[in-house]
């Protein structure tokens, strides 16, 4: 699903860092792990050490405040999150720096943060449909919901 | 799943002030917005404000927004409801709710009953 | 600031009878962005904790009877009861969460009749 174009005025602001050095789990507990250089996935760990740890930045959006928009980048690392194309994996892209403001075709890497009890969704800024999933044998997507899981568990300070 | 427990009920004089508490067993609210309502006597609900801990940034309705104060202890587990220069009609039982980063309530307290007479 | 209208403000529906409560905000509460409507329903029973029963205008919470279901968007939003059972005797009030202050409907008190 293409972005939606009356996106691109909409601009968002880097407020700061609310998280540090969380993991994901999703709701068959596996963790989000490191696939490659470009790719996540999910696996049952024994050991979370394996697991990625991620850090959250909050953006302000010009254009409405009570929705929280975050950026995800991995920790202690200038790998972000970002957002492809409907059962597309999603792409870690590096960056010099967080980005200080995003706008039009760079909201692939933000996303709508829900949280629902323990459930936690992260919906893409470029994609409203679509979320943040894990897929049997498939990388971590976006994808629209079952039989991807895209709902995930934060779990903090693990460090 | 999260539980919240309010503080008992107060009885005010105008003009004072009552600080409710509500502390939440089995997690915390790192992750949530916490919002505050009330309801009067026999009266709908309203909405007096809410905070969400992790922005530490709060949001009153206009009506409260000289008088309410609401906060939250650094262990993320018990959040405050400061109410100022009460008057009879303040009367009513205040709820905290919480359990999504949006202002909706998945668990709410049991409620406090404020009475304000002099 | 949104205002909620519910209506009825009362309703006594028949055991096993379709119950419908509707609630219409004075200005949309779906945000473009996300394509999402930031509307929630309550049940209050006497002496009980608030229950939610629908968030995101249509998603049912964990545990609720499917009986009960969520419709709308924009301004205009339907509770809907598909079979009143006794235990659904109660007041139910719709909630914006679009845009400070998050405001309630006036409630719909449902009996039996």
């Known amino acids: 699903s293409a972005p939606f174009s009356f996106l691109s005025n909409v601009k968002y602001n880097f407020m700061r860092i609310i998280k540090y050095e969380f993991i994901l789990n999703d709701a068959l507990n596996q963790s989000i792990i490191r696939a490659n250089d470009q790719y996540l996935t999910a696996a049952a760990l024994h050991n979370l050490d394996e697991a990625v740890k991620f850090d959250m930045g909050a953006y302000k959006s010009s254009k409405d405040d009570a929705k929280i928009t975050v950026i995800l980048r991995i920790s202690k690392t200038q790998l972000y999150v970002t957002a492809q194309d409907e059962d597309q994996p999603v792409l870690l892209k590096e960056m010099p720096e967080i980005p200080k403001t995003i706008t039009g075709s760079e909201t692939n890497l933000l996303f709508f943060w829900e949280t629902h009890g323990t459930k936690n969704y992260f919906t893409s800024v470029a994609h409203p449909n679509l979320f943040i999933a894990t897929k049997q044998d498939y990388w971590v997507c976006l994808a629209g919901g079952p039989p991807s899981i895209t709902d995930f568990q934060i779990l903090e300070n693990q460090a | 799943q999260v539980q919240l427990v309010q503080s008992g009920a107060e009885v005010k004089k105008p003009g004072s002030s009552v600080k409710v508490s509500c502390k939440a067993s089995?997690?915390?609210?790192?992750?949530?917005?916490i919002l505050w309502v009330r309801q009067a006597p026999g009266q709908g609900l309203q909405w007096l404000g809410g905070?969400?801990?992790?922005?530490?940034?709060?949001d009153h309705a206009q009506d409260f927004q000289d008088r309410l104060t609401i906060t939250v202890d650094e262990s993320m587990t018990t959040a405050y409801m400061e109410l100022s220069s009460l008057r009879p009609e303040d009367t009513a039982i205040y709820y905290c709710a919480t359990g999504s980063n949006s202002y909706y309530g998945l668990y709410w307290g049991q409620g406090t009953l404020v009475t304000v007479s002099s | 600031d949104i205002v909620m209208t519910q209506s009825p403000d009362s309703l006594a529906v028949s055991l096993g009878e379709r119950a419908t409560i509707n609630c219409k905000s004075s200005q949309s509460v779906l945000y473009s962005s996300n394509n999402k409507n930031y509307l929630a329903w309550y049940q209050q029973k006497p002496g009980q904790p608030h229950k939610l029963l629908i968030y995101w205008a249509s998603t049912r919470e964990s545990g609720v009877p499917d009986r009960f279901s969520g419709s709308g968007s924009g301004t205009d939003f339907t509770l809907t009861i598909s079979s009143l059972q006794a235990e659904d005797v109660a007041v139910y009030y719709c909630q914006q969460y679009y845009s400070s202050p998050y405001t309630f409907g006036q409630g719909t008190k449902l009996e039996i009749k």
């Open positions: 089995g997690g915390r609210f790192t992750n949530y917005a």
């Open positions: 905070i969400i801990p992790i922005f530490d940034e709060t």
